[in-house]
Amino acid sequence: LIQERRSHQNNPAAHLTGANSSLTGSGGPLLWETQLGLAFLRGLDYHDGALVANKAGYYYIYSKVQLGGVGCPLGLASTITHGLYKRTPRYPEELELLVSQQSPCGRATSNSRVWWDSSFLGGVVHLEVGEEVVVRVLDERLVRLRDGTRSYFGAFMV
Amino acid sequence: LIQERRSHQNNPAAHLTGANSSLTGSGGPLLWETQLGLAFLRGLDYHDGALVANKAGYYYIYSKVQLGGVGCPLGLASTITHGLYKRTPRYPEELELLVSQQSPCGRATSNSRVWWDSSFLGGVVHLEVGEEVVVRVLDERLVRLRDGTRSYFGAFMV
Amino acid sequence: LIQERRSHQNNPAAHLTGANSSLTGSGGPLLWETQLGLAFLRGLDYHDGALVANKAGYYYIYSKVQLGGVGCPLGLASTITHGLYKRTPRYPEELELLVSQQSPCGRATSNSRVWWDSSFLGGVVHLEVGEEVVVRVLDERLVRLRDGTRSYFGAFMV
């Protein structure tokens, strides 16, 4: 059988997982584990929270974040924004790709009640060589990390 | 045109749908319809709730469950966990792959209020031949089945 | 190297984005932007809100809608249904493919509280040539559009 351009072995794909170091508190994007456990990179690169395309094309990109808290403490936004953003050589600013807004705190009927919520994003976007995709969560203090299964970030070429 | 390794026809894929028999109450994983309606298996096998890989590679696996209830009756967990888990010959225990925790009952402002919520999980994982993936929901009594469109489980090789 | 059937260049894929014209209030499906910004069609057609297959096969179809409101005004359903539906020459009615029900208003603890929620659907379905997939939201008045990143609809062949 003839070797074709898109075998399972070389189709770009990645799945990055949440880790203790994911939340920097610096206003930057979330950081991710790239090798341990369930995490891997195949035909995509990683740098400071970003998946970097090294082959142009359409990619299904996705991210899930696990949110949680106790009531809604003052100083925490009642709206949480979870988004995937693109960095490109063409523009200096990040471009919004896929974004969700949620108000999970409202689920707690008292200030002492524990609540959990999850936000999933996924969609097909075009990436050129060198373009980067990052995940941001505002307010990231509500992201709950554990073992890489609850918050993650990935992509594959379609 | 030469037949290549990854034509649309032979790329492993599956979509399994919720059915009346999905919820066993036995503490086991959810069970799924594999043939009727929207359900199908192509290059993957099924056994007792599990999708079974018969080709090694990276798969995008996904599941959605429809949750619902009336208020939050005592005895039901205020946190619902929905997860995809791997069974492998390498380890005796199931391995968590993708997990979400939600507190949907808190949406109901009174004990008599009907509430609905949905949990979606999806991500790329590596499966070896013979490895199995199952869906679990705790507490599964809050899963609302109807016609296979609201709760489902699927995968395809990327 | 021989040109194969599924190169990255010709694998059907699409991502359509929400626009001011998406919500018609006519009881029909949501309408979408197909060309501007992040939106594109590759090997799929579009007609009046529908993605139309011009190649038979299994497709991962997905949609996200951004929901939001202030309290839960009377006349708005407390349950929101977000679904993907198929139109086929074989049957006169639309067929439910993937559906979610949510009760996001319950998150607001008072009638004046702003709330946000997001609904994501994705799964693999079989489409014949000429079959169409549309997105419906009931009550669509709670869909919040902005710039195409918060509500969208897409597909790709697997």
Partner: antibody, heavy 116, light 107 residues
Framework: QVQLVESGGGLVKPGGSLRLSCAAS????????MSWIRQAPGKGLEWVSY???????YYSESVKGRFTISRDNAKNSLYLQMNSLRAEDTAVYYC??????????WGQGTLVTVSS | DIQMTQSPSSLSASVGDRVTITCRAS??????LAWFQQKPGKAPKSLIY???SLQSGVPSKFSGSGSGTDFTLTISSLQPEDFATYFC?????????FGPGTKVDIK
Amino acid sequence: QVQLVESGGGLVKPGGSLRLSCAASGFTFSDYYMSWIRQAPGKGLEWVSYISRSSFIYYSESVKGRFTISRDNAKNSLYLQMNSLRAEDTAVYYCARWELSPFDYWGQGTLVTVSS
Amino acid sequence: DIQMTQSPSSLSASVGDRVTITCRASQGISNYLAWFQQKPGKAPKSLIYAASSLQSGVPSKFSGSGSGTDFTLTISSLQPEDFATYFCQQYNTYPFTFGPGTKVDIK
């Protein structure tokens, strides 16, 4: 207008090191990805390395592990540290700005000669 | 790596001639192709990006076309300042690779 000026080239023995600089002006340097390209005497062009705004770096296989690209946005400067130089590294080295395509604007080049 | 080939490797033409240079990629690169002009002792100058888009300031006598694996650069009416070497370059996939060049000289 956009200007890129390379410097630091010269004669070096095999195994030696050299540091090239590229001074940028006429645009907001920190907003752009930057690249190095080289051209051996009488030969074609070869891409060497690039650095993104966020300082993600990519190298061609021929220089990986020996060359290091870096940038100093405060000084509007791009650098290429070249170690373990070989005869086949002899070339004119160009820096280029990446906007609509990877090599939209080029400097005039600086010659590196590796010879004993 | 993606290999880029150009033909012809050299050509002789007269002022006013219409000149076409072809570039072929070893695999599909969509429209991620750029063309450069280089004169002796000078740095390359970008002419075309995205296979057919003209760089700012480049005269419209230059045009590019093609997609996938086969591309062409056309100079509609050759002028004395156009005698140079022309390179194509793909940026669909790392590493970026250049064609070997086509030298256009005076007949």
